[in-house]
């Protein structure tokens, strides 16, 4: 058992153009907290995925407000360390999410509104018991800078926090409440005791007696902030205006050690004390071999070229990052063609496509009409993935299966008598009606309604039954012509819907794999 | 140095079963996805199946020809990996290695199985 | 499954050859291709991972190339010890896949 440390030191805008200005949207002021995430060393860093190792949730910050026209500072953080309290052993390696979250206090209906601001992610390697971490980390235009380490709690000692230990005062025999003595090895000292007064926040101490701070803090207890200390004891030119040592950038100033690598100061220069697994002047060479697994997610990891240069990973489909620890999501690029969904299995991507369209990625037009022809002499007319048939006369129904009487709507006018026929219907209209639909009336003096019919189409014209037996003819000539197109497009699709279907097998065997 | 060994092959008969084991040494074991590949005879190589990691929920992956009937499983405290094959087949017969991550890179030395009447 | 096509399936060449092995997909794979050396009762030994890239300790004689469906394993000058079975193998999708191989043999 025992407990990750995190102290936040400031939070900000990173340097260069661009940078903002506030954290603070325009709608009034707010306040920041942050949320500390932690995962072993293995598992995914995607955010959603539990903090098996735990988490824990700052207090509020200070109200910000922005001041027009006033540079952005390090922002007003809440106060305290952030706790994270671990029952099993410390894994040693492990993902350190941070968030920086906003407050809006403005008028929000329903209360304050949160947003995240930044999140910073970091694998790192830290072995419980050592000194604080410290780190710089960008998330965008944001810079967090921030201290952490891994503490055991009595009676768990060690660099995992697995080793059981009483301080060497204490009997040999177990006292009430503690853990079973068995797996007792050696007798072990309790942890130092600080120098009285030393602040818990801003220092600690690694033998008894000391005080050390941490960055940004200064003085004897650790209790005075660097920019408003007192002129005694600061390095740095002397300031003519005030008398006093104005605070010089000091050479552990900005970390110069690498992959969380711990400063601290050195006549005139500095040293690194690097986490497990990182070497050189400025933690900047990884220790860690291919051997030691450090590709996630089956990652090939490829040593370098000589033994001081780092490994590479090389990444499975679907994952990126210098370790293939961040998933890519893929469907995000929008790869499915004509509304498919895109479904992401991991190390295949797959197109669900729409009814009418098949391919890899949809982009096969299937003819909605293929293989669905419409029956009796209906045309097929397709539209947005559906299909609809248009039937002839006589039929009706979806697929124009249901035989239709014609003439049940009474569509002969003015009298006229409806006779059923193949190709429709045919009216024998009332003395003084003529049309298709005996719809016009027949004037008395031998003229219509409508412009002089040439003569032998006058009602009652004997060539009348020969213009209907061409016409039927000419009908039957056009339903022919559609039912040998009909048959060549479901020719021309079959292979397109044999590839859907198998497309979608694969799909199901994948995603219940 | 890296090292896999299997080991665990051996004659059966058809509808009988068999386990292998790869031990690895030289490498941190629990960060490898850990594989099986089988050469038969003559042959070329086909994926049998896979095992990813605790933080994984030590997924398993298996290959449509033997899905049902053959079973991998990891111990991280012992260095190992396990095939349990049930209700083997003549075609079943080959060269079993055993492999680490997604694109094979260490193997192991093989261990034949055969399956026979 | 994505079949790989390797071909030829044999070939005979000499020490200081130019030899060169293909492989085709049955869809696009990317540069998700590796290659791998296998001899007599050896296991397979990874040579080209991402279809171009060299594996750790592999001689520069051996080279990579091609994306999407068309892939090429080229040994520059072939050695005594290049005498052996290639594979190719496709990691675009699960599963993966291999090829025939092709075996190297001396003229």
């Known amino acids: 058992a025992g407990v990750f440390e995190l102290q936040i030191h400031s939070f900000g805008p990173g340097p260069g153009p661009g940078a903002p200005r506030s954290p603070c949207s325009a709608r009034g002021p707010c306040r920041l907290f942050f949320r500390v995430c932690l995962k072993p060393g293995l598992s995914e860093e995607a955010a959603e995925s539990p903090c098996a190792l735990g988490a824990a949730l700052s207090a509020r910050g200070p109200v910000y407000t922005e001041q027009p026209e006033a540079p952005a500072p390090d922002l007003p953080l809440p106060n305290g360390l952030l706790q994270v309290p671990f029952r099993d052993a410390w894994p040693g390696t492990f993902s350190l999410i941070i968030e920086t979250w906003r407050e809006e206090l403005g008028d929000q209906i329903g209360g304050p509104a949160w947003s995240l601001l930044a999140r910073v992610t970091r694998r790192r390697r830290l072995a419980a018991g050592g000194p604080w971490a410290r780190d710089i980390q960008r998330a965008g235009a944001w810079e967090l800078r921030f201290s952490y380490r891994a503490r055991c709690e009595l009676p768990a000692v060690g660099t995992a926090c697995t080793r059981l230990c009483r301080p060497r005062s204490a009997p040999s025999r177990c006292g009430p409440g503690l853990r079973p003595c068995a797996p007792l090895e050696d007798e072990c000292e309790a942890p130092p005791v600080c120098r009285a007064g030393c602040s818990l926040e801003h220092g600690f101490c690694e033998q008894p007696g000391e005080c050390r701070c941490l960055e940004g803090w200064t003085g004897p207890l650790c209790m005075v902030p660097v920019s408003t200390s007192s002129c005694l004891g600061l390095r740095g030119p002397s300031s003519t205006t005030t008398g006093c040592l104005v605070p010089g950038p000091g050479p552990c100033d900005g970390n110069p050690c690498a992959n969380g690598g711990s400063c601290s100061e050195t006549p005139g220069s500095f040293e690194c004390t690097c986490p497990r697994g990182f070497y050189g002047l400025r933690c900047e060479v990884s220790g860690v071999t291919c051997a030691d697994g450090p590709c996630f997610n089956g990652g090939l990891c490829v040593g370098g070229a000589d033994p001081d240069s780092a490994y590479i990973c090389h990444c499975p489909p679907g994952f990126q990052g210098s370790n293939c620890e961040k998933r890519v999501d893929r469907c995000s690029l929008q790869p499915c063609r004509n509304g498919g969904l895109c479904l992401d299995l991991g190390h295949a991507l797959r197109c669900r496509c729409r009814a009418g369209f098949a391919g890899p990625r949809c982009e096969h037009d299937l003819d909605d009409c293929a293989g669905r022809a419409c029956a009796n002499g209906g045309t097929c007319v397709e539209g947005g993935g559906a299909h609809r048939c248009s039937c002839a006369l006589g039929f009706g129904g979806r697929n124009c299966r249901e035989r239709a009487d014609p003439c049940a709507a009474r569509p002969c006018a003015h009298g006229g008598r409806c006779y059923a026929h193949f190709s429709g219907l045919v009216c024998a209209c009332a003395p003084g009606y003529m049309g298709a639909r005996c719809e016009f009336p027949v004037h008395p003096d031998g003229v219509s309604a409508l412009p002089a019919a040439p003569p032998g189409l006058r009602p009652g014209d004997p060539q009348r039954a020969g213009v209907i037996a061409v016409i039927v003819v000419v009908v039957i000539a056009i339903v022919a012509g559609i039912v040998v197109l009909v048959i060549s497009r479901k020719k021309r699709m079959a292979k397109y819907e044999k590839a859907e279907i198998k497309e979608m097998g694969e799909m199901h065997r994948e995603l219940n794999a | 140095e890296v090292q896999l060994v299997e080991s665990g092959g051996g004659l059966v008969k058809p509808g009988g079963s068999l386990r292998l084991s790869c031990a690895a040494s030289g490498i941190t074991f629990s960060n490898f996805w850990m594989n099986w590949v089988r050469q038969a005879p003559e042959k070329g190589l086909e994926w049998v199946g896979q095992?990813?990691?605790?933080?994984?929920?030590?997924?398993?992956h298996y290959a449509e020809s033997v899905k049902g009937r053959f079973t991998i499983s990891r111990e991280d405290s012992k260095n190992t990996v396990y095939l349990q094959m049930n209700s083997l087949k003549t075609e079943d017969t080959a060269v079993y290695y055993c492999t680490t991550g997604y694109y094979f890179d260490y193997w192991g030395q093989g261990t034949t199985v055969t399956v026979s009447s | 499954n994505i079949q790989m096509t390797q071909s030829p399936s044999s070939l005979s060449a000499s020490v200081g050859d130019r030899v060169t092995i293909t492989c085709k997909a049955s869809e696009n794979v990317g540069t998700y291709v590796s290659w791998y050396q296998q001899k007599p009762g050896k296991s397979p030994k990874l040579l080209i991972y991402?279809?171009?890239n060299r594996y750790t300790g592999v001689p520069s004689r051996f080279s990579g190339s091609g994306s999407g469906t068309d892939f090429t394993l080229t040994i520059s000058s072939l050695q005594p010890e290049d005498f052996a079975t290639y594979y190719c193998?496709?990691?675009?999708?699960?599963?993966?896949?291999f090829g025939g191989g092709t075996k190297v043999e001396i003229k």
């Open positions: 193998g496709q990691f675009y999708s699960f599963p993966s896949t």
């Open positions: 095992i990813r990691l605790k933080s994984d929920d030590y997924a398993t």
């Open positions: 991402g279809a171009s």
